[in-house]
Amino acid sequence: QPSVSPGEPSPPSIHPGKSDLIVRVGDEIRLLCTDPGFVKWTFEILDETNENKQNEWITEKAEATNTGKYTCTNKHGLSNSIYVFVRDPAKLFLVDRSLYGKEDNDTLVRCPLTDPEVTNYSLKGCQGKPLPKDLRFIPDPKAGIMIKSVKRAYHRLCLHCSVDQEGKSVLSEKFILKVRPAFKAVPVVSVSKASYLLREGEEFTVTCTIKDVSSSVYSTWKRENSQTKLQEKYNSWHHGDFNYERQATLTISSARVNDSGVFMCYANNTFGSANVTTTLEVVDKGFINIFPMINTTVFVNDGENVDLIVEYEAFPKPEHQQWIYMNRTFTDKWEDYPKSENESNIRYVSELHLTRLKGTEGGTYTFLVSNSDVNAAIAFNVYVNTKPEILTYDRLVNGMLQCVAAGFPEPTIDWYFCPGTEQRCSASVLPVDVQTLNSSGPPFGKLVVQSSIDSSAFKHNGTVECKAYNDVGKTSAYFNFAFKGNNKEQIHPHTLFTP
């Protein structure tokens, strides 16, 4: 019994005065607590606690389940204990088969003994299987057997507490160890889509998938820059051991424009945190935005090809697309396709392929597109560059020589005189009159130019050249002069097209 200095409060004294007491099953347990300030007896075994306010604890017929620690406490909070073993050959172990352990921590197999004098108190695998080689344990007859530093590999390990009694091995009921893994990495989070575009009133639903080693991972949906609690629903699965998956689905049944923003799925465990975001854009109505990929004014040479290309954003999906020229719709020569195969793609491409364009095929080419909410269009003005063509070359009654040429861009007409039989016409002649005429064709057709010179200026035999040219090429027409005496013979025009 403890001895203390006079005047100081002392712990209670217990009779019998020993730390451990062994009684046989069926015998009486009689424990007396002596203290002027007695408060209570407490009995503890396997997380059980029973109290008794009598200073004498009497159990007339002891059972194995009366094995445990009996503690007497006084009003000063000082206490004294005795451990009682109730020896029962038929019940060597008291057990609580709950067995949960955290990875890297110790866990207690609760199988305290009713008889401290048995030997070889240890753990054994079920059905004669050996325990893992690295499993270390410490037996304590009053508490059970402590497994040191639980490993993940011990999960679902089946084991018994074991003792030797009179040369025979006796096993407890079986225990199944459930190991709660330690977090050794942050959770893995992913989101069903990185961005959402909706019209007002449509449902917004997004799912975050959280993967970790156990269900004790924490997760939540948050709205950035907001503390509002969001409504979410969960589904979860254990895909075998240490492979847990949770799906957290956030839903806004009728989205509004002011619901637009960034939503974050956040997850954390004791190792760290991870997050992933998704962006919601809610528009009051659908839209179409068209972006030309080439200049909307196009110049192309006669006989060449050109591709008119647009990209456009359309939400909701485009329903009708067409290319139009001179009030006629193209049925072929064009293609329309999404810019990407991504599920949230709203960008599309449309291409009109114009091949071997003729001078008469210039004009306005229009792309039209519509969805359930809006229509949109874009026009391309196509100009076909053509080499000048001399339409007429005549001597007029007033003695003028006139040359009319058409082409695009607008041709320039120069005049030259070639004396005698010379092939080269070098001396230039200034025109008397130059006019650009209105074409009777479409507005994007060839431009017509008329130029005139006075033939009376020519006093010698020779040839007059009318040369029409632009950026694309040139064409010439010729007038032949022949003098007989003082008379000018009939002028014979002819043309030479110069490539």
Epitope: E48, T49, D96, S98, Y100, R156, K178, S216
Partner: nanobody
Framework: EVQLLESGGGLVQPGGSLRLSCAAS????????MSWVRQAPGKGLEWVSA????????YYADSVKGRFTISRDNSKNTLYLQMNSLRAEDTAVYSC????????????????RGQGTLVTVSS
């Protein structure tokens, strides 16, 4: 064959009471601490309460403390849960299960768990 059979569930108004029972057979009932767990629609499994092998110690989740009482009768191999002052958020399937993990996480589950009884709290 191990069996855990829950009963006593039903529809109750907010503020009302129910007593759930769990009859155990096929294993040594007094060798296990026992737990009640619940699963609300669309939610994960939630631990509610536990009791030690002989009923001397009881444990409760914060959400039910002061309203629910767990008890056991080892002579009848039966576990009980007295539920008072019920709320709409208590609506769930309640199951009894063998074992008690002080962390409340029950990783790897339970050795045995019943199919459950539905408790609906609604006006």
């Amino acid at each position: 064959e191990v069996q855990l059979l829950e009963s006593g569930g039903g529809l109750v108004q907010p503020g009302g009471s129910l007593r759930l029972s769990c009859a155990a057979s096929g294993f040594t009932f007094d060798s296990y601490a026992m737990s009640w767990v619940r699963q609300a629609p669309g939610k994960g499994l939630e631990w509610v309460s536990a009791i030690s092998v002989r009923g001397g110690s009881t444990y409760y989740a914060d959400s039910v403390k002061g309203r629910f009482t767990i008890s056991r009768d080892n002579s009848k191999n039966t576990l009980y849960l007295q539920m008072n002052s019920l709320r709409a958020e208590d609506t769930a399937v309640y199951s009894c299960a063998t074992g008690y993990d002080p962390s409340g996480h029950y990783y790897g589950g339970f050795d045995y768990r019943g199919q459950g009884t539905l408790v609906t709290v609604s006006s």
